[in-house]
């Protein structure tokens, strides 16, 4: 946030921008949390936008049973390695088909034991609060579905009649990895020494970073006339004087009209 | 890239027999699986004949004992030689390759086809 400042008085202001603002001939250049023309105010919002989606990775190995090995399959650039890779992606597409946050799969090795498979099962579902949940049900969901093709899918007198076949002894989930994002996390870091007075609150599932400075949220500070303003002892009301009245108290909601007091004060003369 | 041309189809009288083959250009023909596949009105395509670089071999049940898959790789070509034929053989044969050695009947797994060439068998 800048303000643009004109006349003699510009040379003082450079030599004044707080809060690491930076004066860059105009006005002060003031950091994310500040704004103001001297960055002297603390913002109310911070921007935490979660990223749009949030990913997961489940490492599986897998017995092919239906290939047998050769040592072109190790090489990633064989043509052997090209049209197994075809073969098994479309095999696990067809076993993944029902889950929504099904991305691909991507092989890391083959080796031999008729061909194991090592790769990498790939899940993906857009940013809500409840990411954690729906990408555990989806691993879950993942296990049981190449539980039951492994199981079903296996070679009778040494033949195949599917697209893959598997040894179902051979089918083990390595390790689940799940990006992590947490707002509130975020939300603490980027408020920097004013971390304790910012909280997250959701909007449209969304998550807002914001003081009791930012309007319209439920931990608001309702300053009715006055200014919210943020320091390092929390959010302060500064309260406002007008032509009749005077505002005091924690949220500016004791007005004091001036007419009374002079008054008050031309009866005690 | 493999590339297939089957060729030999044509019709003939029950009992009687047929060679078709399959020509392949663009790679060795040492290495991984062949077959012939056949699709009749109305069906799915089903694995006929197929054999493997490492000498394995498979015959669907009702063309056991009467047709012999075989290849000549000085020639890169692939054969079917059908014998006894019957009406229920007249179909639309195919050859397929796979540089993978495979042991399956199903079509999804093999990654090249030939054109296909039509067998008919009248009584």
């Known amino acids: 946030r800048t303000t643009t400042c004109f006349g003699d008085g510009c040379q003082n202001t450079a030599s004044r921008c707080k809060n690491g603002g930076t004066w860059d001939g105009l006005k002060c250049q003031c950091p994310n949390l500040y704004y103001g023309e001297l960055c002297e105010e603390v913002v109310s919002s911070i921007d935490i936008g979660p990223p749009e989606t949030i990913s997961a990775q489940m490492e599986l190995t897998v017995t092919v049973t239906s290939v047998k090995f050769t040592e072109e399959l190790k090489n990633h650039s064989s043509q052997e390695f090209q049209e197994f890779k075809q073969t098994f992606t479309e095999q696990m597409n067809i076993v993944y088909s029902g889950i929504p946050e099904y991305v691909g799969v991507n092989i890391t090795k083959l080796r031999l034991g008729s061909v194991v498979v090592e790769h990498d099962v790939l899940l993906r579902t857009k940013y809500t609060p409840e990411y954690k949940t729906v990408l555990d049900n989806a691993t879950e969901v993942v296990k049981e579905k190449i539980t039951k093709v492994t199981t079903q899918q296996i070679m009778i007198n040494d033949i195949c009649s599917d697209m893959m076949c598997f040894n179902t002894t051979g089918t083990q989930v390595q390790n689940i990895t799940v990006t992590q994002y947490d707002p509130e996390e975020d939300c603490r870091k980027m408020a920097k020494e004013y971390g304790d007075y910012f909280v997250v609150e959701y909007r449209d599932q969304k998550p807002y970073c914001i003081s009791p400075c930012e309007p319209g949220f439920s931990v608001s500070k309702n300053c009715n006339l006055g200014k919210c303003q943020m320091s390092l002892s929390g959010p302060q009301c500064l309260c406002v004087t007008t032509e009749t009245h005077w505002y005091s108290g924690e949220t500016c909601n004791q007005g004091t009209q001036k007419s009374l007091v002079y008054g008050h004060h031309h009866h005690h003369h | 890239e493999v590339q297939l041309q089957a060729s030999g189809g044509g019709s003939v009288q029950a009992g009687g027999s047929l060679r078709v083959s399959c020509a392949a250009s663009?790679?060795?023909?040492?290495?991984?699986?062949w077959g012939w596949f056949r699709q009749r009105p109305g069906k799915e395509r089903e694995a006929v004949a197929l054999i493997s670089s490492d000498g394995w071999t498979f015959y669907a049940d009702s063309v056991k004992g009467r047709f012999t898959i075989s290849q000549d790789n000085t020639k890169n070509t692939l054969y079917l030689q059908m014998i006894s034929l019957r009406p229920e053989d007249t179909a639309m044969y195919y050859c397929?390759?796979?540089?993978?050695?495979?042991?399956?009947?199903?079509?999804?797994?093999?990654?090249?086809w030939g054109q296909g060439t039509q067998v008919t068998v009248s009584s």
């Open positions: 663009g790679d060795t023909f040492s290495r991984g699986s």
């Open positions: 397929a390759a796979s540089v993978l050695v495979l042991r399956t009947l199903n079509p999804k797994a093999w990654h090249h």
